[in-house]
């Protein structure tokens, strides 16, 4: 599967609208630093199947699109760019769907990229604890804001070696 | 490969002005805060202060505010250090460092060279 | 601002030693303690961050400890490229702040 080109632009566009969302200076934010534990083996490109690090980041981007749907992160943002926001993950949805659908056939998705998917819903699941936590203080919001944000990076810089590879 | 390369030495008089560079490459700049950090002859570390590149937005030591201007241009992927009127006490080696903001990440892990300012008459 | 006090401020040791240098912060820093080590005309370089993470490519004879105010950077068995002075260095809130450093010297 060729990623098309328009879905590497919308995950840039989203890391932007990413970082225009700040509200208050991360200066403040230093003591409120956490390790998530991002699963940097799952997006592993050379490693594990292009299929399994397709579905692992559609998988994330379903779940950052759930973090950013809650009622919680619609007062801790911005509402215009939370709008925007949700248009490019959906975009990026579609295009993560055809993509491995594609590459693999709908029935064996399930089964062979089950322990990605557990491994990324793992890790959203230690983001949103760590906001029940910190009583979705504006500064855990920004800590988890910069963390999304470097996964998305992360998983931007796979996406040109998965097409390098095609 | 990640790297802070820093402008060359320099030799001024007390009163002058000074903006000393520091251009990051082999990452992404505004991914990173950039740091500066004073070290006098025969001395310790001084942290100065940071800025982050992705809006400018900076904070200063306390020593130093008012001292000094950091700046940043994103789009050439470099920090700076200013003075508008050096002192003799400025004599000193001048580092950055990039930190990586609010991510679980090392903090300070790649330094420029150093860039050694004399302030004599 | 938090004071950082580093303790000895130098040393005298021999290869093969175990060396231990402390850092105590004015107040509690939780565990964001980093350690650098520096040489003569260099720039310092990373060795443990997070108080006890061990920096990439960095020899695992270095080892960190502590959280809250009390910090520990240990040599387990001191190497000829080890003698430099190393600075601990706070970075829970701005300003950040270095120790005053330790020199390990020759004995």
């Known amino acids: 599967c060729d990623l098309p080109q328009t879905h590497s632009l919308g995950n840039r566009r989203a890391l932007i609208l990413l970082a225009q969302m700040g509200r208050i200076s991360h200066f403040s934010c230093l003591k409120d630093r956490y390790d998530f534990g991002f699963p940097q083996e799952v997006f592993d490109g050379n490693q594990f199947q292009k299929a399994q690090a397709i579905s692992a980041f559609h998988e994330m981007i379903q779940q950052t699109f759930n973090l950013f749907s809650t009622k919680d992160s619609s007062a801790a943002w911005d509402e215009t760019l939370l709008d925007k926001f949700y248009i490019e993950l959906f975009q990026q949805l579609n295009d993560l769907e055809a993509c491995v659908t594609q590459e693999v056939g709908v029935e064996e998705i399930a089964l062979m990229n089950e322990d990605s998917i557990l491994a990324v819903r793992k890790y959203f699941q230690r983001i949103t604890l760590y906001l029940m936590g910190k009583k979705y203080s504006p500064c855990a919001w920004e800590v988890v804001r910069a963390e999304i944000m470097r996964s998305f990076s992360f998983s931007t810089n796979l996406q040109k070696g998965l097409r390098r590879k095609d | 490969e990640v790297q802070l390369v820093q402008s060359g030495a320099e030799v001024k008089k007390p009163g002058e002005s000074l903006k000393i560079s520091c251009k990051g490459s082999g990452y992404s700049f505004t991914s990173y805060w950039i740091g500066w950090v004073r070290q006098m002859p025969g001395k310790g570390l001084e942290w100065m202060g940071i800025?982050?590149?992705?809006?400018?937005?900076?904070r200063y030591s306390p020593s130093f505010q008012g001292q000094v201007t950091i700046s940043a241009d994103k789009s050439i992927s470099t920090a700076y250090l200013q003075w508008s009127s050096l002192k003799a006490s400025d004599t000193a080696m001048y580092y950055c460092a990039r930190h990586p903001g609010l991510n679980w990440a090392p903090d300070f892990d790649y330094w420029g060279q150093g860039t050694l300012v004399t302030v004599s008459s | 601002d938090i004071q950082m006090t580093q303790s000895p401020s130098s040393l005298s040791a021999s290869v093969g030693d175990r060396v231990t240098i402390t850092c105590r912060a004015s107040q509690s820093i939780s565990k964001f303690l980093n350690w650098y080590q520096q040489k003569p005309g260099k720039a310092p370089k990373l060795l443990i961050y997070f108080a006890s993470s061990l920096q990439s490519g960095v020899p695992s004879r270095f080892s960190g400890s502590g959280s809250g105010t009390d910090f520990t950077l240990t040599i387990s068995s001191l190497q000829p490229e080890d003698f430099a002075t190393y600075y601990c260095?706070?970075?829970?809130?701005?300003?950040?702040?270095f120790g005053q450093g330790t020199k390990v010297e020759i004995k």
């Open positions: 260095q706070q970075s829970n809130t701005l300003p950040f702040t």
């Open positions: 800025i982050d590149p992705s809006d400018s937005d900076t």
